[in-house]
Interface confidence: medium
């Protein structure tokens, strides 16, 4: 007992969908998990829409655990998931299906990640190995952000502007980040 | 007090399966996670797979392809199927338990161990 387990730290982690038998107390009562948040930031108009509703960049809120390996966070995070389309969707005929179905008309916007936060988290790890400290990002807000024609899904602009403004008084972030650069993942934990 | 008991070890060729089981008893708290371990003779006990009550698994780059960990909650019976054996998996499986309580372990348990012999 007590032995150095295997350190699996080589291998893939895959993020693996859970589901806990029952919620950690001290979420138990918090209203604000597995929500949207007021349905995100009320969007700028780049064209004209009669109801507001339809740019929905919502921000929902879940709570995972961070894996890594054998080992598992002792307690779940909380962030946000970016959800919902941003601009207005038009309801076309579909000429093959005989139905209806939409498509956003115009640029194509997104609705994802804004800004993140770091957090430092202990990982619990079985057969008597050492816990392990992690640091992981989190995604903090969500925006509806432009992609043009001339830009793949990476070089995203700001909804309802031409260009990115860079933020004040801050380094640029690497763009990509590899997946051996964030080495403990995320598990979903409802 | 909780008691891991494995089960389903044996003699089998090269290339054949097994399929271990180990049961726990006793007072187990729902945040936890179940795995199999080995020691072949003269080694260090090594990680095999482990399985968190979420449903999370592991294994050691050895094992991937060719066992399967999978439990059963309402019994507290976690399995390993292991298929495509090799002379180089024998050794004896041992079974653990770890719970966590409020972001903390509480408890490692052991069983005593099952052995495997893969041999023609």
């Known amino acids: 007992q007590g032995w150095q387990a295997f350190k699996n730290d080589a291998t893939e982690i895959i993020p693996e969908l859970g589901e806990y038998p029952e919620p950690p107390p001290e979420l138990e009562n918090n209203k604000t998990m597995n929500r949207a948040e007021n349905g995100g930031r009320p969007p700028h108009h780049p064209f004209e829409t009669k109801d507001v509703s339809e740019y929905s960049c919502r921000e929902l809120h879940f709570t995972r655990y961070v894996t890594d390996g054998p080992c598992r966070s002792a307690k779940p995070v909380t962030e946000l998931v970016c959800s919902g389309q941003c601009g207005p969707a038009r309801l076309l005929p579909n000429a093959i299906g005989r139905g209806k179905w939409w498509r956003p008309s115009g640029p194509d916007f997104r609705c994802i990640p804004d800004r993140y936060r770091a957090q430092r988290v202990q990982l619990l790890c079985p057969g008597g190995e050492a816990p392990r400290a992690r640091k992981v990002r989190l995604v903090a807000s969500c925006k509806c952000k432009r992609l043009t024609r001339f830009h793949n899904q990476s070089e995203l602009k700001d909804f309802g502007t031409e260009a990115a403004r860079p933020q004040k008084g801050r380094k640029p972030r690497p763009r990509a980040r590899s997946a051996k650069a964030n080495q403990a993942e995320l598990e979903n934990a409802y | 007090e909780v008691q891991l008991v494995e089960s389903g070890g044996g003699l089998v060729q090269p290339g054949g399966s097994l399929r271990l089981s180990c049961a726990a008893s006793?007072?187990?708290?729902?945040?936890?996670?179940m795995g199999w371990y080995r020691q072949a003779p003269g080694k260090q006990r090594e990680l095999v797979a482990t399985i968190w009550s979420s449903g999370h698994t592991n294994y050691a780059d050895s094992v991937k392809g060719r066992f399967t960990i999978s439990r059963d909650n309402a019994k507290n019976t976690v399995y390993l199927q292991m298929n495509s054996l090799k002379p180089e998996d024998t050794a004896v499986y041992y079974c653990?338990?770890?719970?966590?309580?409020?972001?903390?372990?509480?408890?490692?348990?052991w069983g005593q161990g099952t052995q495997v012999t893969v041999s023609s």
């Open positions: 006793g007072s187990i708290f729902s945040d936890n996670v």
């Open positions: 653990n338990l770890g719970t966590i309580v409020t972001g903390t372990w509480r408890s490692d348990y």
